[in-house]
């Protein structure tokens, strides 16, 4: 049994880090493998993560960490029984993937304006809270070509767009994701999408 693709890990910079790797053949990750992780410092306690399958030869592990802070560094040991398959290290604050925003809502009761709001996935005491920017993806369920991205570079978790920028009388979906430039993070996963029916009054044309 060998590791084909070494573990790569990302952290939500709060309490969960996720590591993924690939084995050289079909593997029952949860019964055959264990990922041990330990805070690098003195005699800190070692923790064990039981991986799950992620495709035939792929494994994923969700590492629960006690309040990740910037000085934390972890050693990672991947074991198959008594055999050490791989040894590495991981600094959560240098491999941040933010949590996905939540509670995406489309408010259609503002005259001819769509107001999209969502929740910041971090509490105010977390450094990322004031450093997230967002991308909002809106697409038509009827027309795959009608697909757009709005970059929200201000801190407020909201976006206003004129309803008239979208087609009237059809259904749209929206989703949002986040990233933080200050930590050069990757993008978060997309939030669950929300659906609405876009309708607005066409401006009266005089001839």
């Amino acid at each position: 049994m060998k590791v084909l693709q070494e573990p790569t890990c990302v952290s939500d910079y709060m309490s969960i880090s996720t590591c993924e790797w690939k084995m050289n053949g079909p593997t029952n990750c949860s019964t055959e493998l264990r990922l041990l992780y330990q805070l690098v410092f003195l005699l800190s306690e070692a923790h064990t993560c039981i991986p799950e399958n992620n495709g035939g030869a792929g494994c994923v592990c969700h590492l629960l960490m006690d309040d990740v802070v910037s000085a934390d560094n972890y050693t990672l040991d991947l074991w198959a029984g008594q055999q050490l398959l791989w040894k590495g290290s991981f600094k959560p604050s240098e491999h941040v993937k933010p949590r996905a925003p939540g509670n995406l809502t489309v408010h259609t009761n503002v005259s001819d304006t769509l107001l999209l709001t969502w929740s910041n996935p971090y509490p105010p005491d977390n450094y990322l809270y004031n450093h997230l920017t967002y991308a909002v993806n809106i697409w038509s369920e009827n027309d795959p070509a009608d697909f757009r991205i709005y970059n929200v570079t201000y801190l407020e978790p909201s976006l206003r767009i004129a309803a008239s920028t979208l087609k009237s009388g059809i259904s749209y979906r929206a989703r949002v994701r986040a990233w933080a430039q200050c930590y050069n993070t990757t993008w978060s996963e997309w939030s669950p999408s929300t659906k609405w029916h876009n309708s607005y009054r066409e401006p009266f044309e005089q001839h």
């Epitope: 690098v40 410092f41 802070v69 910037s70 000085a71 560094n73 005491d125 450094y127």
Partner: antibody, heavy 121, light 107 residues
């Protein structure tokens, strides 16, 4: 506003014990890691110990490990430092410190006024 | 452990001068560095974090720069109230380690 108030310092003989307390207010105590930093007379700052927010992880400088124990009571908003087997070189002003954000380690935006520990026979 | 070497250990400057204090890390710490000011008989005060981010309420004459192993604190126009000892602190890894301090005196 954030307030940190240390207490429990005093004069103790070598080999003796003391327990320092740091009463906190003005922030969500249970969300932050908290730290003790000390300063010997006329010397620089030295990191002593940190306890993470939920109290499951404690970290110590080599100079105090196995002698000092950091703990916290999130219900009482209080941080503690139990100091045993004290040595003359532990003589210092002891500060408790809170980081600016819950996931920063040593970016201490708030400090107590300090409590003095003197170890002498 | 990461060693932090601060220089100079003391310096004397005139009001209005531009003052620079440097901190050298024994290994790369990216931008995981904070600067503190400590006046006599007082607790330290955070000036800069993240290598270059100015803490709220700190005068803009203070600035921090550098990354990796070399960092600088600059005071661009020294004022009487800046008489203090300045410390750098690496927050890249445990144990956290301070520089030995720079005592700033006014000529």
């Amino acid at each position: 506003q954030v307030q940190l108030q240390e207490s429990g310092g005093g004069l103790v003989q070598p080999g003796g014990s003391l327990r320092l307390s740091c009463a906190a207010s003005g922030f969500t105590f249970s969300s932050y890691s908290l730290t003790w930093v000390r300063q010997a007379p006329g010397k620089g700052l030295e990191w002593v110990s940190t306890i993470k927010a939920r109290g499951g992880t404690t970290l110590y400088a080599d100079s105090v490990k196995d002698r000092f124990t950091i703990s916290r009571d999130n219900a009482k908003n209080t941080l503690y430092l139990q100091m045993n087997s004290l040595k003359p070189e532990d003589t210092a002003v002891y500060y408790c410190a809170k980081p600016l954000y819950s996931n920063l380690a040593g970016d201490f935006g708030s400090w107590g006024q300090g409590t003095t520990v003197t170890v002498s026979s | 452990d990461i060693q932090m070497t601060q220089s100079p250990s003391s310096l004397s400057a005139s009001l209005g001068d531009r003052v620079t204090i440097t901190c050298q890390a024994s290994q790369s710490i990216s931008s995981y560095l904070a600067w503190y000011q400590q006046k006599s008989g007082q607790a330290p005060k955070l000036l800069i974090y993240g290598g270059s981010r100015l803490q709220t309420g700190v005068p803009s004459r203070f600035s921090g720069s550098g990354s990796g192993t070399s960092f600088t604190l600059t005071i661009s126009g020294l004022e009487t109230e800046d008489l203090a000892t300045y410390y750098c602190l690496q927050v890249y890894s445990w144990p956290l380690t301070f520089g030995q301090g720079t005592k700033l005196e006014i000529k």
